[in-house]
Structures are given as C-alpha cells and as structure tokens.
C-alpha cells in the first residue's frame, strides 16, 4: 500500500491539506492546482479533469474557500419559533416532540438489540473457529500470536467479554498463564473497537457525515492499536501489568462479590432471547480442547434442564487412573473407581425463532448477520433523521455547548477527564463499550459531538468495560476468582496506561489526528473504509497468525523488514513535513515512487472498474440498500433512492447542473433536500422544541 495515500505533491508546509495527513486540520484544497496537474508529471496541463462518475456529489460551482470539514455543521432551525406559535401549535409541537422522543427511544432500543443479535450472529458464524484459535499451544511462548488471537476471536464473536471469559476459564484451569493471557486481553481490546467502525459505515450516504462518523469510530481503533504498539513490547520486557496486578490480588483478601448489575440487558434480553439464544459454553469448551464440543450446536435448544449428579462405579485399567486413591478398589477381576456422572434431563425448550428449525450454526448465523445489519442500519438512519429534526436551533446550541464546551480557565483541562468519567459511567450502566461507542458514532456523524470530545468519552468507555469485568471477576466462584480478577485488572491497567500515553498532553493525542486523516481519506474514497476494516481487523491479524504458526524465524524474517520499511517511511514523512532541507531533492516528495505506491487514485480506478457493474444495477428499494449501494459503487445519485437505474444512466450522460457541495450547506437536512434526497418539509409542520 501507499506510504501515504495521496502524496503526489508533498509540500514542506504542514498547513497544506494533504489527503490523509493525519496531523493537520486541513484547509480546502486548491482545485486549480489539482486539476491542472497530472499524477505522473510535474508539467502543468490545460486539460480540465472530468469529475469521476463515482463522486457522491458533483462539486461544480464550488466556492474557492470551503469551511474546515471538521467544523461542526450549524443545524439551523427551519421551523416557527415557540413564542410565535398559538396554543394549538404549541400543543401539537409538544406531542410531536413526545412522539419523536418515543420513536428515538424505540429505535435506540432496537439499535442496541440489533448489536446484541449481531454479536450472536458473529458467534454462530465464527465462534467455533474462534474457540479453536485458543487451543493453539504457541500462545504460551509467542505474545504476538496471543495478541492477534485476541483480535481475531473478539472480531469473530463481536464481544470482548466472551473472549475474556474464555481466557479466564483457561487461566483458571491452568491451560494458560496470566503472562500469556495479557497479550490476548490487549487483542480483545482492539477487536471490540470493530463494532462502532461497522456502525460508522452505515453513515456512508453523506460525505461530511461519514467523514466525522468514521473518524469518531476509528479514534477508538487507533487508541487501541497505538497502546498495544507501545505497551506490548513494554509488557514483554518488564511484565509490569502482570507484576502490578499480582501484587494487588495478593494484597487483598477478596470475598466473592455479587454479579455486576445487568442494567441494559434487563431491557434488551426479553426481545433478543425471542430471536436467538446461544450456549456460549460451547466456545469455551472448544478453547479447552473438548472434542465433544466441536460437534455441539451453539444454538440453545433446551432452556429448562434438570441436572442429576450421581456417582457410578467404573472400571479403570490401573489404579493410576483412579479419580482419587481413596476411591479405588478391586473386585478381584477388575479395578474400579467412583466417577461423578451428571445426567442432564431436558424439560422445556427455549422460546426463540430458531429452536425448531435445526439449521446448522452457519446458516442461522448468516441469516441473523444479514437481518441484524439491516435492522442496525435502518435504526441508525432513523436515529440520525430524528436527531437531525430535533437537534436544531436552540436545542442544538444548548446540547452542543453542553457537550463540547470546556470548563472556564484555569480548569479547562479537567473537562476531558470529566468526559472520561462520563464515558466510564455510561459504559458501566449499559454494560458494553460496543453499545456506548456505537451510540456515540451517529452523534459524531451528525455533528452533535466533536471528535475531540468523543475521544475522552471513548477512553472512558474503555475503562468502564474493565470495571464491569472487575465486578464480574469478584462474583466468580472461588477457583476462578484469583485468575479472573488478575486478568480484569490487567485489562484495567492496560487501558489506564494507554490513557496516560495518549491523552494527558495534547501533543500526544495521536489517535485524533490519525482518525481525522483516515476520515478524510474515507470521505474521498469510501471503499477505503471497508478496505481499512478488512486490513486491520482481518488480514494483518491473520497474516501474523499464519507467520507465527510457521515459526518465529519466519515471523521475524518477514516482520523485521516490514517494520523497518514502516519506520523508514514514517521518518521520511516526518522529515518531509518538518525539515525537508536535510533531505536530498529527490526525497523531498514522494514523486520518485510509482503512482500506485503514493496515491489512492489508481487503486480507486481499479475499485471503480470492479464496482462499475453495480453502478448500473444499483437499484435501491429502501434507504438501507441505498447505504450499501453507496459504499459499493460510490454512485452520484444513489442516495436519492428513487428510480436509481435510470437516474444513474442519465447522470452518466451529462452533468451540467451546478450543485453545491454538501459541506457548504449549513444544515444537513437542507443539503440533502438540495440533492433531492428528501422532500423539502413544510416549515409550518416543522417543530424543534421537545
């Protein structure tokens, strides 16, 4: 891949906007410069570059100065002011507000439920494979393998608590040491951040919204990746997490506590258990090398069972096979021992859709994966629409000021830490960092929360999920208490260490700059978002996993040159932007590299070729399909969701209607109206006050 996505004309000036330059707050690119230059030569050309057909909005008639895309949009009020309304209007508006609130809560409920079902779907599709990752004996000696297993398993089961509980049970039964478990926990931390990144993809319809949402989601990814990048080598060298947590566990005489309160699950479980119920013990059993578990289905069939424990006499080849020396004897013919046998009697079947279908796990998982993604997407779109209509004018101003404004001087620095506490508290309430960060993503997208504010909230969410784990550990049975508590504390201190690395000093807040860079790239080339997801959460971990299986020599042989190249590119990039004079003329920009190595344009052409077939057949019957269509073919009018096929053909023939860029509109709703996406609403019926 390119050392930097668009480095055709790298300038020493750090203020110049480069696509993907994570470190900058970009200004608008100079279009004349861009269009009067080909990618492979530096000679100016008079030919005007045609706008690509895959661009979402035709950027003709664009003003020379465009606002910073990271500035929050002004959500202007198109409705009548409250004071200007008559009594009937006020009552109507009040009930409209109540209706919207109910709808918002309803969609929010199904959004959270769909996240739960999505997790179940992933477990059905990849749970057994995830369990088998754990049964790899090399985890003990190879922390890098442990890390990628943590990532892959959590991505496959869409739940860090599931992968963490497998690790806990393996440590409890001495199949894994705490030392070997720490990299897996770090990996689980990374894996859990995929959920909100998937949620961000659902906001692909609007470029500016997608830019913010995707950056807001990936700030979590970058924080986790960067923390691991620094803290894994530190842990391998010093074992500081293991030592600190061991001291804590040993210094306290913990008594078994109560289970962490399931606040959100209480509300969502009644619905989700009607869809599907899983026997999550199966994944753990596979991880523990239980051969019988490999043939078991994850779909729970029997919910009410009676377990009868009895002792039976069984023959053993020799006394060495006895359950205990005192429970061994002979009848003169064979050696006997007593074995505890648990007879499971099925009493009542579970009450969920798939209970009587007897479909394979993969089939159930695939069905649920598609349905949950559709519901997730639908709910997200509706949440964004409702929030878009509610958060206007005064309401928006108040909310945005409350959330994004810092404390007065000299306490401004405290605001972020309060946000961390809020994030931790909210996550503790909802019992899931995925739910919290996924709920945050659309708010970032529509511009209610800035990325700068979302960052500490996300960090707090990381802390919140570990406090839940600590509480759960304290409720563990005696034999598992020690190991589960130590692992939960490792998770906690890892996140605390990460925050200390990437938050207190504004200069070190690299995840924000990197996320913004990725947001810029993904807004321009939307396929890159999917590409990023596949690369970082699947390909890199799978490659490392494969190389680790081949042996540490192969891993080092491939890994060292790759790491060296990355470091070299980063150093060069740093020198180019900070002090290019120290570099030879040739190295002052990236033009010495072939175009495909320094720009995403050639890759974009390839992707466009592949998705070209979709462009003509991109008929969207609903908004949900429309979002998927936008992501696939990047077609200009697909988000109008009307007679898509004909529209596209017309669009290809000639685009002579000047349309403003959506970024230049003050109101998201207005910008979509101008593009013909939503009908302009009658201002008389528009209501903003709740």
């Amino acid at each position: 891949m390119a050392p930097w996505p668009e480095l055709g004309d790298a300038q020493p000036n750090p203020d110049k906007y480069l696509e993907g330059a994570a470190g900058q707050q970009p200004t608008a690119p100079d279009k004349s410069k861009e269009t009067n230059k080909t990618d492979n030569t530096e000679a100016p050309v008079t030919k005007i570059e045609l706008l690509p057909s895959y661009s979402t909005a035709t950027l003709i008639d664009e003003p020379t100065e465009v606002d910073d895309p990271w500035n929050l949009p002004t959500l202007q009020d198109s409705g009548i002011k409250w004071s200007e309304r008559d009594t009937k209007g006020k009552i109507l508006c009040f009930f409209q507000g109540i209706g919207r609130l109910i709808l918002l809560l309803g969609f929010l409920y199904f959004f959270v439920c769909s996240l739960d079902i999505l997790s179940s779907a992933f477990q059905l599709v990849g749970g057994k494979m995830a369990g088998q990752f754990f049964s790899n004996s090399s985890i003990m000696s190879n922390p890098l393998l442990g890390l990628v297993i943590g990532v892959l398993v959590t991505v496959l089961v869409q739940s860090s608590s599931t992968s963490t509980s497998i690790v806990v049970s393996m440590v409890s039964s001495s199949l894994l040491t705490v030392r070997a478990a720490i990299p897996i926990i770090m990996g689980a931390n990374i894996g859990t951040s995929i959920t909100n990144t998937i949620v961000a993809l659902m906001q692909v319809g609007d470029r500016s919204e997608f830019r913010r949402a995707f950056a807001g989601a990936t700030v979590h990814d970058f924080f986790n990746w960067l923390s691991v990048l620094v803290l894994l080598p530190v842990e391998v060298a010093t074992h500081y997490l293991e030592i600190i947590t061991q001291l804590i566990v040993e210094s306290f005489h913990f008594k078994n506590g109560e289970d962490a309160p399931d606040l959100l699950k209480v509300i969502t479980k009644p619905f989700t258990k009607l869809i599907v119920q899983l026997d999550k013990k199966v994944i753990s059993q596979i991880a523990m090398n239980d051969e019988k578990a490999k043939n078991k289905s994850l779909v729970k069939i029997w919910c009410k069972t009676f377990t009868n424990k009895t002792q039976i006499n069984v023959t053993v080849p020799s006394t060495a096979n006895c359950t205990s020396p005192s429970l061994c004897w002979t009848d003169g013919i064979q050696n006997w021992t007593m074995k505890n046998v648990t007879y499971k009697e099925n009493i009542a079947k579970c009450q969920h859709i798939f209970v009587n279908f007897h479909l394979p796990d993969l089939a159930v998982g695939t069905i649920l994966l598609i349905l949950s993604l559709l519901v997730l997407c639908g709910c997200l779109i509706m949440i964004v629409k409702i929030l878009g209509s509610v958060l206007k004018g005064q309401v928006a101003t108040v909310i945005k000021k409350t959330i994004n404004t810092d404390f007065p001087f000299p306490f401004a620095w405290l605001t972020g830490y309060l946000a961390i506490l809020v994030g931790a508290g909210m996550t503790f309430i909802v019992q899931s960092s995925s739910v919290f960060t996924s709920a945050l993503t659309p708010l970032i997208g529509i511009g209610v929360i800035t990325i700068e504010r979302a960052y500490p909230l996300t960090l707090g969410s990381n802390i919140g999920t570990t406090t839940t784990a600590i509480l759960a550990a304290l409720a563990s049975p005696g034999n598992a208490l020690r190991s589960s508590l130590q692992i939960a504390l490792c998770h906690f201190f890892f996140n605390i260490s990460g925050i200390l690395l990437w938050y207190p000093i504004p200069f070190t807040r690299l995840p924000i700059r990197m996320a913004k860079g990725l947001g810029n790239i993904s807004a321009k080339y939307r396929w890159f978002a999917v590409f990023y997801l596949i690369i970082f959460f699947f390909l890199i971990p799978l490659t490392v996993f494969g190389l680790s299986l081949a042996g540490w020599r192969v891993l080092v042989g491939v890994g060292v040159p790759v790491v060296f190249i990355i470091i070299l590119v980063l150093c060069l990039r740093l020198l180019q932007s900070r002090c290019p004079r120290v570099l030879p003329k040739k190295l002052q920009n990236w033009n010495f590299l072939p175009l495909w190595m320094r720009s995403l344009k050639p890759w974009d052409a390839v992707v466009s070729k592949f998705t070209g077939c979709f462009q003509m057949r991109c008929c969207c019957c609903c908004r949900v399909c429309c979002r998927a269509c936008c992501l696939l073919c990047d077609c200009p009018k697909c988000c109008r969701c009307s007679k898509c096929c004909e529209d596209l053909e017309e669009a290809q023939e000639g685009q002579d209607v000047p349309v403003k860029a959506p970024e230049t509109f003050d109101n998201i709703t207005i910008s979509r109206e101008a593009q013909g996406e939503v009908p302009a609403s009658d201002s008389k019926t528009e209501c903003t006050a709740l």
Epitope: C328, D331, G332, I333, N335
Partner: antibody, heavy 121, light 107 residues
Framework: EVQLVESGGGWVQPGGSLRLSCAAS????????MYWVRQAPGKGLEYVSG????????YYVDSVKGRFTISRDNSKNLLYVHMGSLKPEDMAMYYC??????????????WGQGTLVTVSS | DIQMTQSPSSLSASIGDRVTITCRAS??????LNWYQQKPGKAPKVLIY???SLQSGVPSRFIGSGSGTDFTLTISSLQPEDFATYYC?????????FGQGTRLEIK
C-alpha cells in the same frame, strides 16, 4: 446356610491337567463373584483366579495365565477351574471362595474346606 | 503388584493379653484392607473388611484400624480360640495380594 464344597483334587504328573469343581448352596450363586485361592503346604495364601457373577469376565494371576481356565455354570451353581500344563509349584490346597456382589471390594466372606492338588513325578 | 508385609511373623502371648499385628502395603491402598484368621487344617475366615469394619459373627475384641499404607489388627483381650495364623489382604488393585501371615501362639 452358605456352603462351598470343592472336589476334583488329587495327584497329577507335571504337564498334566486337572479340573476342580466347587458346588455352591445356601445363597444366590448367580449374584456373586467367585474366586480360587490356593495355599502351598506350610506357606501363605495366594490368589489364583476370579470370575464375575455372569461369567463374562475373569482374572488370572500371572503365574497361571494361559494354563488355567475359570468358568461357572449358574444353572447348576457350580464353579470350575481347568488346570493345564501343571508344574510342581502348582501343588497346593485349592480353596473356592465367595466374594461380595459385583463392583464391591474383594472380600472373601465364605470359603470351602479346600481340595488338595499334588503335582509330582 | 502391591506387596503386603506383615509383622511380626510370629508372636507368643497369654490369654487376656492385648495383641497388635501390623500390615504394611508397598503403596497407598486407601482403606481397602481385609483381615483373615486361619486355624490349622481349616479354611480362612474373614474378621475385618475395609480396614475397620467387623464382619458379622466376629467378636468385638477384634479391632481393625489404619489407612493408606499402615494397618493394624488389635485383639483387645486374647481368648484361647484366638490362637491361629492371621493374614492381611489388599482389595485395592488386581492382582489381590496377601501378607505372608502372622502366627499367634500361646506363651
């Protein structure tokens, strides 16, 4: 009253064979494991063989394995041991003993009066 | 195979005496040890099973104890009919093995 009566003992040349029988009465024969225990003159007790209540599984001490065969006829309440390739060291008093029921520790709660087997040339 | 070692090999005692016979196993056998009494020209008779349980019809002066590898048979007050040879037997694993016996004689 539980009674076990052994028969079939006598003099035999080395390499010869002999079949001992044990007639049981006074208890449900088919419910008990049965054993053969021997005692060489002036020596201690030595376990020889055992057979399960249904006759399907049996055990032989290493020194007699492949030469002795234990069997039972639950319909006639009889226990047998067929001794082949007899050696001088097989010369002993052979006792038939009753064990507990299946799967309980081997306790020889009732013994026969014994039958003497003499192996000499 | 589990070796059973009895001590002493023989002992002399008077009527009314308290007599203790010990039996040691080459490995732990839990409590799966039985004691037998054999009088000259007669078949053995079970006295104690699973280390300490008294067989029905056996006088209560016979007391069995021990677990693991060390076991004892105690005759609290020796009676004339108690002069015989005593054997210990393990029923922990096949093959079943007996001790070499302890001959109890009148002093």
């Amino acid at each position: 009253e539980v009674q076990l009566v052994e028969s079939g003992g006598g003099w035999v040349q080395p390499g010869g064979s002999l079949r001992l029988s044990c007639a049981a009465s006074g208890f449900t024969f088919s419910s008990h494991i049965m054993y053969w225990v021997r005692q060489a003159p002036g020596k201690g007790l030595e376990y020889v063989s055992g057979i399960s209540s249904n006759g399907l599984s049996s055990y032989y001490v290493d020194s007699v394995k492949g030469r002795f065969t234990i069997s039972r006829d639950n319909s006639k309440n009889l226990l047998y041991v067929h001794m082949g390739s007899l050696k001088p060291e097989d010369m002993a008093m052979y006792y038939c003993a009753r064990g507990g029921r299946d799967r309980v520790p081997a306790v020889f709660d009732y013994w026969g009066q014994g039958t003497l087997v003499t192996v000499s040339s | 195979d589990i070796q059973m070692t009895q001590s002493p090999s023989s002992l002399s005692a008077s009527i009314g005496d308290r007599v203790t016979i010990t039996c040691r196993a080459s490995q732990s056998i839990g409590t799966f040890l039985n004691w037998y009494q054999q009088k000259p020209g007669k078949a053995p008779k079970v006295l104690i099973y699973v280390a300490s349980s008294l067989q029905s019809g056996v006088p209560s002066r016979f007391i069995g104890s021990g677990s693991g590898t060390d076991f004892t048979l105690t005759i609290s007050s020796l009676q004339p009919e108690d002069f015989a040879t005593y054997y210990c037997q393990q029923s922990y694993s096949v093959p079943i093995t007996f001790g070499q016996g302890t001959r109890l004689e009148i002093k």
